[in-house]
């Protein structure tokens, strides 16, 4: 006869491990007992369980409540056992010793491999600001056994670097994603992808990029200067900019206070029916936590009675 077992049994942390040991004997042969022991190199054998043809299953005190026979029906030549709720410390070498009649004793070894799936974590880097050089966008760490694979999935251009720390029974892998921040990256997903044999599918953690910036400011509304004449209603100036975080707007008049009747509504400056009093230099001040910008325009309200129109100057300043 001969023993049938597996070289390696692989199980995920917390699952039950079936340790196979089947005696394929000739007709008339009987199995008296099957003794299971853990036999890691450098350590003495530690008894696990005894399957006895007469006495039944004995579980050694160290494994009490954790070793069972597979559910019926059972073949009397099958010495397999179930190790319940495998933990990392169970990883190692196991031996089954089968005592048969009349053929004698047989033994076989197997290795139990306990996969510890990672629980990845993603940590964003420091605040990203347009104009910075190469900056850490995020780091992703995953610890498991064996070492997990950590990669990145994104449309954003950047560079990655990885490092690994080996522990006694596992390994931690950290991958960093660096980029040169630009406003086009704002709102783009950066996804950490963790692969591991103990996972049914890759684990993904997505971080949305936020890049602080503030665009140049400009003012719209003076494109047709002939519309700015005395008596015109509904005249307005609109300040144009964009930023992250979204900017706030403030209007002032460089050569004095805002005329009465002029309404400030965020990025828009609304005028009452135009008079020559509304002529002047208006400044739009745009700011967010990252920066501030100014844009100024000169408004010259035309008198229709005069033949020649006045020039309108647009000046932008930062």
């Amino acid at each position: 006869g001969e023993l049938e077992t597996s070289d390696v049994v692989t199980v995920v942390l917390g699952q039950d491990a079936k340790l196979p040991c089947f005696y394929r004997g000739d007709s008339g042969e009987q199995v008296g007992q099957v003794a299971w022991a853990r036999v890691d190199a450098g350590e003495g054998a530690q008894e696990l369980a005894l399957l006895h043809s007469k006495y039944g299953l004995h579980v050694s005190p160290a494994y009490e409540g954790r070793v069972e026979q597979p559910p019926p029906p059972r073949n009397p030549l099958d010495g397999s056992v179930l190790l319940r709720n495998a933990v990392q410390a169970d990883e190692g070498e196991y031996e089954c010793r089968v005592s048969t009649f009349p053929a004698g004793s047989f033994q076989a070894r197997l290795r139990l491999r306990v996969l510890v799936p990672p629980l990845p974590s993603l940590n964003p880097g420091p605040a990203l600001e347009e104009g910075q050089g190469l900056t850490l966008a995020a780091s992703c760490t995953a610890e498991g056994s064996p070492a997990p694979s950590v990669t990145w999935d994104t449309e954003v251009k950047g560079t990655t670097s990885s490092r690994s720390f080996k522990h006694s029974r596992s390994a931690a892998v950290t991958s960093e994603f660096h980029l040169v921040p630009s406003r086009s990256m704002n709102g783009q997903p950066l996804t950490c992808v963790v692969s591991h044999p103990g996972l049914l599918q890759d684990q993904r953690i997505t971080h949305i990029l936020h890049v602080s910036f503030l665009a140049e400011a400009s003012v719209r509304g003076l494109e047709d200067q002939n519309l700015w004449h005395i008596g015109r209603e509904g005249a307005m100036l609109k300040c144009l900019s964009e930023g992250q975080p979204p900017p706030s707007y403030n209007w002032t008049r460089l050569d004095g206070p805002l005329p009465s009747g002029v309404r400030v509504d965020g990025d828009t400056l609304g005028f009452p029916p135009l008079t020559t009093e509304h002529s002047g230099i208006y400044v739009c001040h745009v700011s967010n936590e990252f920066s501030s910008r100014d844009s100024q325009v000169t408004v010259d309200v035309l008198d229709p009675q005069e033949d020649s129109g006045k020039q309108v100057d647009l000046v932008s300043a930062s």
């Epitope: 008296g32 007992q33 003794a35 008894e47 005894l50 006895h52 007469k54 006495y55 039944g56 299953l57 004995h58 050694s60 005190p61 010793r97 005592s99 004793s105």
Partner: antibody, heavy 126, light 107 residues
């Protein structure tokens, strides 16, 4: 025919020592596990100590641990029980017994006691 | 340690009676259980091992059953030489432990 004959019992004062012997014959002594079991007067049976043939593993009841030592000399087919620091509660008939040999090379379990000696009386009294 | 509880502690019966003695373990012991007979002034004698296997030379009127925690010794037809004290013993763990004994007396 399997025979187990104990000797060495007697009267001893508390704190004293005795060494019990068990001479085995009629079987291959070195292939069997052995045990000592005692029975106080009018009381039930209490397992005291055992020794495995496999690597000579020994084990003891908590009540005698640290005071009693079991050993065997396979060349003389003899089992021993060295008893030190004896107490009044150790007074009993001490039996040596052979363990049934149907568990092979597995130390975590003992087996039934299929042959017993006639016993030797140990009396601890001042 | 595993506690073994026998019942009854004593019983009176007549020759020819069917006698049943029970033994309960404080935890599961599979079939790691033996039954012994002891007569006054004599060493115990193994009757049953592995809960239900009859030891060589023991009359077939003795039988054992059970597994796990509950076990039974049955004497199908009590004979004069069967009047004795009977002990159960677990050998699942060290130390092996005995029940307190059941004394079978003549009615």
């Amino acid at each position: 025919e399997v025979q187990l004959v104990e000797s060495g019992g007697g009267l001893v004062q508390p704190g004293g020592s005795l060494r019990l012997s068990c001479a085995a014959s009629g079987y291959s002594f070195d292939t069997y596990d052995m045990s000592w079991v005692r029975q106080a007067p009018g009381k039930g049976l209490e397992w005291v100590s055992g020794i495995k043939q496999y690597k000579g593993y020994t084990s003891y009841a908590d009540s005698v641990k640290g005071r009693f030592t079991i050993s065997r000399d396979n060349s003389k087919n003899t089992l021993y029980l060295q008893m030190n620091s004896l107490r009044a509660e150790d007074t009993a008939v001490y039996y040596c017994a052979r363990e049934y040999s149907d568990v092979v090379d597995y130390v975590s379990v003992r087996t039934p006691l299929d042959y017993w000696g006639q016993g030797t009386l140990v009396t601890v009294s001042s | 340690d595993i506690q073994m509880t026998q019942s009854p502690s004593s019983l009176s019966a007549s020759v020819g009676d069917r006698v049943t003695i029970t033994c309960r373990a404080s935890q599961g012991i599979s079939s790691y259980l033996a039954w012994y007979q002891q007569k006054p002034g004599k060493a115990p004698k193994l009757l049953i091992y592995a809960a239900s296997s009859l030891q060589s030379g023991v009359p077939s009127r003795f039988s054992g059953s059970g597994s796990g925690t509950d076990f039974t010794l049955t004497i199908s037809s009590l004979q004069p030489e069967d009047f004795a004290t009977y002990y159960c013993q677990q050998h699942y763990t060290t130390p092996p432990t005995f029940g307190q004994g059941t004394k079978v007396e003549i009615k």
